[in-house]
């Protein structure tokens, strides 16, 4: 049974509702019309809707849907954005502390190596920061560069203080000797392993959080299809055409429509669940050498031990290096 | 306050870092995040239901709209889309996700693979090859105190290495302090949009 036409057989009530959506436009018929041109709200009898109104309803329906989606994801989005920012800031603070601790170790134990050591330490921790943020830097190279840079200064300041200030050519020979003779023992390898493991995990943790934001942003700004727009219009607005302003859609019908509109989005579900569970697994494993806070804040100690190792073997090393880098040293003395 | 580098007497193998009761560490913050994220594990599957519950639907009314006509809420017609031949709901589902959704699914697959690769079996502290080289530091036995270093004359214990307070208020070196970098944390009671979307059906 078609519902009765609006009171007094006018479309007055429909007009006042539509005015809220589209103020000032005269698209609402004065009295119910056949509505043969309608494509979505197909009438069973006279209707208070025109083709233009239908288009406006479709636009509004899709807009409503987008707003509902955005409000649905607001808390989740805020949670991830907030944490991504907090963790990035926290990791940078850890790096800054680690740098300060390492500089303090040099200042207190090896004042003759400063300020050069400060610069090498600064470079190392700069690269650490950049690596965490996703830069294409090799951790082993970073650690090698730190020890390559430190050794010429240790050699000329601690082991062989008689040498003049080191020039680049003897430095290069000393850098080569550092690796060939394993002057720091296994400490560089230990640091490489610990730093690379902890930084890799930290980096992927931040990457995962940033991807979480991207996922929410993507689904947040989805543009719904015309088909979906028609379904939503029929569910939310077609009742108006019959003057049924206060009627609400049936719950089961709404679910069917939403599942149709969101079929694509719901496909993310499986991978989203896996994402959260995989992230949990990663976080559970972030301790000891997989925890950058633990590793970086302890680096000063390992570097200190590595320099002590060099000092213990200084006699033997000085003789060997004296022969190895004799050519460079002669050039420097001239 | 945290000690400045001048206050770190490394030669005495002592590292003082302020300890605050009930402080929030980075690892506890990570775990807290995971717990909160897990309450959103059903976010996407629950979305259709969430949107229906947050848009006008007939809950207590006897009559409701099924897209074509007014029907009784519990009748068979209530769930049926009244407009047959308009377009097929099944077709809409068959179209598959939009390209942007497919792209994000690919990215999720990739990160999930990376996360799985990186996740370490519980209890493994150091790699075998490092253990063999004699760098295994042994278990400190106390979650609060982590061993750092691993050779030389005695280990350094760092008590709760960083106090990770919600607003990241560290006593940093003046020349190292970031300008206006304090980050407020969302308080649970400030969030009113919705809770536990995963539980909405």
């Amino acid at each position: 049974q078609p519902p009765p036409p609006p009171p007094d057989a006018t479309c007055h009530q429909v007009r006042s509702f539509f005015q809220r959506l589209q103020p000032g436009l005269k698209w609402v018929p004065e009295t119910p019309v056949p509505g043969s041109d309608l494509q979505v709200c197909l009438p069973k009898g006279p209707t208070c809707c025109s083709r233009k109104m239908e288009e406006k309803y479709q636009l509004t329906a899709r807009l409503n849907m987008e707003q509902l989606l955005q409000s649905a994801s607001m808390e989740l989005k805020f949670l991830i954005i907030q944490n991504a920012a907090v963790f990035q800031e926290a990791f940078e603070i850890v790096v800054r502390h680690a740098k300060n601790y390492t500089n303090a170790m040099f200042k207190n134990n090896y004042p003759s190596l400063t300020p050069q050591a400060f610069e090498f330490v600064g470079e190392f921790f700069t690269d650490v920061s950049l690596y965490i943020l996703g830069s294409d830097i090799n951790v082993d190279d970073m650690v090698n560069e730190l020890f390559d840079s430190l050794f010429p200064v240790i050699y000329t300041q601690l082991m062989n203080p008689g040498l003049p200030d080191s020039a680049l050519d003897i430095n290069e020979c000393l850098r080569g000797a550092r690796r060939d003779l394993k002057v720091f023992g296994n400490f560089p390898k230990l640091i490489m392993t610990q730093v690379s493991k902890s930084l890799q995990v930290t980096r992927i943790f931040l990457q995962a959080l940033n991807l979480g934001i991207e996922v929410i942003n993507t689904t947040d700004h989805l543009k719904f299809s015309k088909d979906c727009g028609r379904m939503l219009t029929r569910m939310w607005y077609c009742s108006y055409c019959q003057g049924l302003m206060m009627v609400k859609p049936c719950g089961g019908y709404c679910n069917v429509v939403m599942q149709g509109c969101m079929a694509g989005v719901v496909e993310i579900d499986k991978y989203w669940r896996e994402y959260i569970l995989s992230l949990e697994e990663l976080v559970n494993g972030m301790y000891r050498i997989y925890d950058m806070e633990n590793v970086l804040l302890g680096l000063f100690s390992t570097i200190h031990d590595s320099i002590q190792y060099v000092q213990k073997n200084a006699g033997k090393l000085t003789t060997t290096i004296g022969k190895l880098c004799a050519h460079s040293q002669q050039r420097q003395y001239r | 306050s945290a000690y400045y580098p001048e206050d770190l007497f490394i030669d005495k193998k002592v590292l003082k870092v302020a300890h605050v009761e009930h402080e929030e560490t980075l690892s506890s913050r990570r775990r807290e995040l995971i717990q909160k994220l897990k309450s959103f594990i059903s976010f996407y599957s629950a979305l259709p239901g969430y949107i229906c519950s947050h848009s006008p639907v007939a809950e207590n009314d006897t009559l409701c709209w099924n897209g074509q006509e007014l029907v009784e809420r519990y009748s068979q017609k209530a769930a049926r889309n009244g407009m047959k031949n308009q377009f097929n709901l099944h077709e809409l589902k068959m179209k598959g996700p939009e390209p942007v959704v497919s792209q994000i699914i690919d990215k999720l697959k990739h990160i999930n693979q990376l996360l799985r690769t990186m996740s370490m079996p519980k209890g493994r502290v150091l790699d075998k090859n490092l253990d063999e080289e004699g760098f295994e530091s042994g278990d400190c036995g106390d979650d609060e105190d982590e061993c750092i270093g691993g050779s030389g004359d005695g280990m350094i214990k760092v008590k709760n290495q960083l106090r990770f307070l919600a607003e990241l208020a560290y006593d940093l070196d003046v020349d190292d302090a970031p300008g206006n970098s304090q980050q407020a944390t969302p308080k649970d009671n400030e969030i009113s949009t919705f809770h536990n979307l995963g539980n909405v059906h």
Partner: antibody, heavy 116, light 102 residues
Framework: QVTLKESGPTLVKPTQTLTLTCTFS??????????VGWIRQPPGKALEWLAL???????RYSPSLKSRLTITKDTSKNQVVLTMTNMDPVDTATYYC?????????????WGQGTL | QSVLTQPPSASVAPGKTARITCGGN??????VHWYQQKPGQSPVLVIY???KRPSGIPERFSGSNSGNTATLTISGAQPMDEADYYC?????????FGGGTK
Amino acid sequence: QVTLKESGPTLVKPTQTLTLTCTFSGFSLSTSGVGVGWIRQPPGKALEWLALIYWNDDKRYSPSLKSRLTITKDTSKNQVVLTMTNMDPVDTATYYCAHSRIAARRVLDYWGQGTL
Amino acid sequence: QSVLTQPPSASVAPGKTARITCGGNNIGSKSVHWYQQKPGQSPVLVIYQDTKRPSGIPERFSGSNSGNTATLTISGAQPMDEADYYCQAWYSTIMVFGGGTK
């Protein structure tokens, strides 16, 4: 797009201090991984690096000129300033500032037009 | 005297392959960048991190680096490629340029 422009006096008397300003756009010196460097080139000669400042305010100087150079940044104004004390006729050169990608091993990927 | 050694000049017939070398002790362990500078102009980055080409740089420019020599190669050199070429590397905390090749 990234642009940099050097400005400063064209003529400086011996023993005086040279102050050069690099004004840039298209990037921010508060972005992680960004740096700005100064390089000079005496007429008909090779490029010589002077100084580099990082986003985190770390500074690096040429060892041979370190005692005479100071590099500073003003992030809000998008400017980097280089001062060089005790100028000498041998310091006559075109002075360039350049954008540096610190992560890409300190490459200088965008250069200013230079100031003589 | 620069720690990175470049030949002062190099010449090649149009369409042929030009190779410019940059020598340095164990330079293969460094990342080397190459710049092109035409008369009266600012330098332009043509190769970075040994082998990478910035966008807008023709494919004829390529780079390699191993042992004690880094090389910039211009395959099918053109008259417009006539310029000074500088190699650059980062030594710990110091930026070093080669002496340039015309």
